[in-house]
């Protein structure tokens, strides 16, 4: 495959990661309300998110509620809050400078520095993927720590929520999409001969014995 | 041996705070969620709030829910139980517990708390 | 809410004796995720803190005499003492630890 469509197909899964991690981060499905058990007689859903908690009512009623104080959140909202804003704004700088090094736009002279340019892009887009990851994951353990804790209350356990699946399938799009932009950058500026014009030295002057320097024929 | 000394009890008028504290000894208070009871006088028992490990997470009984905040501080091993606008029928012994598996294995000796004019 | 209810309320005992007293859930208190049946059993004696006897309906507490027996069903649950003693002249609780908010019976008062 050429770089080119290396690159195409990179920034395309780098684009619909990206545009599912927004989706994930502002659904308020990040945990939603386990049932355990048949007798809990219980006539609504909650779902929790980074922004809003959400009661689903048997009837399908819908209400939520924006978190009021942002100091009132546990310590692990607000890092995914943090973590993830970051990751989606880190993926808008790294679109500017994929497209910036893309062989099909002319913002960068062709040559080693595109490619380096477009190589950062693929860098930033695995980035993404991994900043991202860390509060899906870690926002996961919790939740899955206390699902088995005898401690903690039956009617207060919590499974995964749909935002933290599309958040890891979002992370998986945006780190092979990265790893296919370096790929297309490094296709570019592994083949010299191919990618760039080769450049000749004009042949020394003669020696003072008249001779010419034997490396220059070939 | 495990042991929890409550403090901060006594009279308090209606509309008054009060903070109660439980210094916990004899086991690793991170280790545990906590919680406390209460007992109005000849009566039975209640719970009032739980808390977990950290105190990422709390629980309060629909009586104190908005009014009471229970918290920890487990660099000095000790819960706490933040009660504003006391109503008389607040008046009991508070016990702080222990609180593995949702039940209560390690009790306090209890604290009174009178709210009265 | 889970309302326990106990009773007898209050229960005249001898020495030696094999007592039963009983409490009933609104609703059951088995788990069918862990098959277990989330009530406890609590001796509070005159002048002290309670004292837990018995969790998960039958488990009793290292330390609590054998002759303490708890048992149950979903709904249903009893706590037996046999060989009645003099020190265990008490109010007894039971209480739902199955979900929030956890909630106590009004207790049975062992008398002489």
């Known amino acids: 495959m050429g770089s080119a469509a290396l690159e195409i197909l990179g920034l395309v899964l780098c684009l619909v990661g990206w545009g599912g991690l927004i989706l994930a981060c502002g659904l308020p499905m990040w945990q939603v309300t386990a049932f355990l058990d048949h007798n809990i007689v219980t006539a609504q859903t909650t779902w929790k998110g980074l922004w809003m908690s959400c009661v689903v009512q048997s009837t399908g009623h819908m209400q939520c509620k924006v978190y009021d104080s942002v100091l009132a959140l546990s310590t692990e909202v607000q890092a995914a809050r943090a973590l993830t804003v970051s990751a989606v704004l880190l993926a808008f700088v790294a679109l500017f400078v994929t497209l910036a090094g893309a062989q099909c736009t002319t913002c960068v002279a062709p040559g080693p520095a595109k490619a380096r340019v477009a190589l950062t892009g693929g860098v930033l887009y695995l980035f993404c993927g991994l900043l991202a990851l860390v509060p899906l994951c870690w926002f996961a353990n919790i939740v899955v720590r206390e699902f088995y804790d005898p401690s903690v209350p039956v009617s207060q356990k919590y499974e995964l929520g749909a935002a933290l699946y599309i958040g890891w399938a979002a992370t998986a799009l945006l780190m092979v999409g990265g790893c296919l932009l370096c790929c297309g950058a490094w296709v570019c500026t592994g083949r010299p001969d191919l990618s760039f014009p080769v450049k000749y030295s004009a042949p020394r002057r003669p020696t003072a014995t008249g001779d010419y320097d034997k490396k220059n024929y070939v | 041996e495990v042991q929890l000394v409550e403090s901060g009890g006594g009279l308090v008028q209606p509309g008054r705070s009060l903070k109660l504290s439980c210094a916990a000894s004899?086991?690793?208070?991170?280790?545990?969620?906590m919680a406390w009871v209460r007992q109005a006088p000849k009566k039975g028992l209640e719970w009032v709030a739980s808390?977990?490990?950290?105190?990422?997470?709390?629980y309060y009984g629909d009586s104190v829910k908005g009014r009471f905040t229970i918290s920890r501080d487990n660099a000095k091993s000790t819960l706490y139980l933040q009660m504003k606008s006391l109503r008389s029928e607040d008046t009991a012994t508070y016990y702080c517990?222990?609180?593995?598996?949702?039940?209560?294995?390690?009790w306090g000796q209890g604290v009174m708390v009178t709210v009265s004019s | 809410d889970i309302v326990m209810t106990q009773s007898p309320s209050s229960l005249a005992v001898s020495a030696g004796e094999t007592v039963t007293m009983n409490c009933r859930s609104s609703?059951?208190?088995?788990?069918?995720?862990?098959?277990?049946?989330?009530l406890a059993w609590y001796q509070q004696k005159p002048g002290q803190s309670p004292k837990l006897l018995i969790s998960?309906?039958?488990t009793r507490e290292s330390g609590v005499p054998d002759r303490f027996i708890g048992s149950g069903s979903g709904t249903d649950f009893t706590l037996t003492i046999n060989n009645m003693q003099a020190e265990d002249l008490a109010i007894y609780y039971c209480?739902?630890?199955?979900?929030?908010?956890?909630?106590f019976g009004a207790g049975t008062k062992l008398e002489l």
């Open positions: 004899g086991f690793t208070f991170s280790d545990y969620y």
């Open positions: 998960l309906a039958s």
């Open positions: 609703q059951s208190l088995f788990s069918s995720g862990d098959q277990k049946k989330f």
């Open positions: 808390i977990s490990y950290e105190g990422r997470n709390t």
């Open positions: 517990t222990r609180h593995p598996r949702r039940y209560f294995d390690y």
């Open positions: 209480q739902q630890h199955y979900d929030i908010p956890y909630t």
